[in-house]
């Protein structure tokens, strides 16, 4: 019951998790403009993975797309590919946890194969969730980098004649989204892998049977193997590699008209 | 068609307040915020603030704090504006504007409001 | 507050003629959000409220007439009037539309001969 309970507290931390990293990747609040410390500017900046986006003082939000692949920095790629695989690694485990979960029947599978897939999706799980937690990790790092750079660089003008304010940008709500359902898939994985130890069979103990030779009086006890959780050299523990390709549809944003007072 | 009429000049003495107001028609009242520019006689502009009709929002000049209140009233959709302890400085035409949704620009401007501070 | 400089303050020409004014600003007007001056020029003529000319320091106005051209970027911007018209007797005024507070130029008046 235990085990059950833990497999499908796993599965539903998972889902959370990973509908949460799918939302972190497409919101564009990755970054937002800084207002603190910083001239009152009557328009509002903000920056997502796939595009970046102006609110006006009326509250007409304006986002625009990043139509351009190489022009893009290698950080801001290499975050975009962390989270599209943590997405579709995630995606994968909930499909084989899915089959996986013990309260669903699926033919004639057998206990073994179960605590198999649990195990896979389990290890899936943790994989999306640190890659999500590493996406979300280096972009704020180059947020943090970028900001202290802009405010050493802050009100370098002309010869000192004309300011120039650079706009400052921090973390973003996707961000923290991200971080968030990133520990919750990491910590639904660890569910499952502990849901496998109890899902694997086990196997017959067998009770202690007196043998009476001619000549001398010898008990053999054979000792009672337990299983080793199904997972020795019989079993043949496969990784799943997935090369698959995201197309980004991109949706249209409603802003409201009174976002600002 | 949009537009914004103001209410007609205004003659008050040192030290009192006035109220004037700006009723907007051809338009969503609630949906554009709503600007007030003083121009002093032969002078150039100056900005004292905005109300968004929609919640009441304001945000003021700094300079205007405490000298203009501004507010508005949905069912008539008008915008006011109250100075306060007039002085001769207060003197000047007063103009509301509609900040344009799209771009950053006041798109409409009433016929303006002329104040005269005078005892 | 962000100071708005405008010359020449005053300008006389003939019908026809091409003018040209500037308006310097203390700060750059330049979002680096969307690439956009947020720099405007209003047109004010004697006893009327002012009207709305150019924005995003360049976009004209629909029913401005084509004559009038706003370019520039940063703290530098001009207004070009190609051939000027008599109409277009009125005091020309940029505007800082990016920080808070809004600020003016002190204005352009143009005089026709």
């Known amino acids: 019951m235990a085990v059950t309970a833990c497999q499908g507290l796993g599965f539903v931390v998972s889902l959370i998790g990973i509908a949460g990293i799918i939302a972190a990747t497409c919101m564009d609040q990755w970054s937002t403009q800084d207002l603190y410390n910083n001239p009152v500017t009557a328009v509002f900046n903000y920056q997502g993975l796939w595009r970046s986006c102006v609110r006006e003082s009326s509250g007409f939000t304006e986002c625009r797309g990043y139509f351009t692949l190489l022009g893009l920095p290698a950080m801001l790629q290499a975050v975009r590919a962390l989270m599209i695989v943590g997405i579709v690694l995630g995606a994968i485990g909930l499909l084989v946890s899915i089959f996986a979960l013990k309260c669903i029947r699926i033919g004639s599978m057998e206990d073994s194969a179960k605590a198999n897939m649990t195990l896979t999706s389990g290890i899936m799980f943790i994989v999306s969730g640190l890659c999500a937690i590493a996406g979300v990790s280096v972009f704020a790092n180059m947020l943090v980098t970028n900001f202290w750079m802009s405010t050493a660089n802050m009100y370098t003008g002309m010869g000192g004649m004309v300011q120039t304010v650079q706009t400052r940008y921090t973390f973003g709500a996707a961000l923290f989204v991200g971080w968030v359902a990133g520990g919750l898939t990491l910590i639904g994985g660890v569910m499952m892998c502990i849901a496998c130890r109890g899902l694997a069979p086990e196997e017959t103990n067998y009770k202690a049977v007196s043998y009476h030779a001619s000549g001398h009086s010898v008990a053999y006890k054979p000792g009672g193997f337990k299983a080793s959780t199904g997972f020795g050299s019989n079993t043949k523990n496969k990784k799943i590699y997935d090369g698959g390709a995201r197309t980004e549809d991109e949706v249209q944003s409603y802003p409201s008209k009174h976002d600002y007072v | 068609q949009v537009q914004l009429k103001q209410s007609g000049p205004e003659l008050v003495k040192p030290g009192a307040s006035v109220k004037m107001s700006c009723k907007a028609s051809?338009?969503?009242?609630?949906?554009?915020?709503m600007h007030w520019v003083k121009q002093k006689p032969g002078q150039g502009l100056e900005w004292i603030g905005y109300?968004?009709?929609?919640?009441?929002?304001?945000k003021y000049n700094e300079k205007f704090k405490g000298k203009a209140t501004l507010t508005s009233d949905k069912s008539s959709s008008t915008a006011y504006m109250e100075l306060s302890s007039l002085t001769s400085e207060d003197s000047a035409v007063y103009y509301c504007?509609?900040?344009?949704?799209?771009?950053?620009?006041?798109?409409?401007w009433g016929q303006g409001t002329t104040l005269t501070v005078s005892s | 507050d962000i100071v708005m400089t405008q010359s020449p303050s005053s300008l006389t020409v003939t019908a026809g003629e091409k003018v040209t004014m500037s308006c310097k600003s203390s700060q750059s007007l330049l979002n680096g959000g969307n690439q956009k001056n947020y720099l405007t020029w209003y047109q004010q003529k004697p006893g009327q409220p002012p009207k709305l000319l150019i924005y995003?320091?360049?976009t004209r106005e629909s029913g401005v007439p084509d004559r009038f051209t706003g370019s520039g970027s940063g703290t530098d911007f001009t207004l070009t009037i190609s051939s000027v018209q008599a109409e277009d007797l009125a005091v020309y005024y940029c505007q800082n539309d990016y920080y808070y507070p809004y600020t003016f130029g002190g204005g352009t008046k143009l005089e026709i001969k």
């Open positions: 109300i968004n009709p929609y919640n009441d929002g304001t």
């Open positions: 995003w320091a360049s």
């Open positions: 051809g338009y969503t009242f609630t949906s554009y915020v």
């Open positions: 504007a509609r900040r344009g949704y799209y771009g950053p620009y006041f798109d409409y």
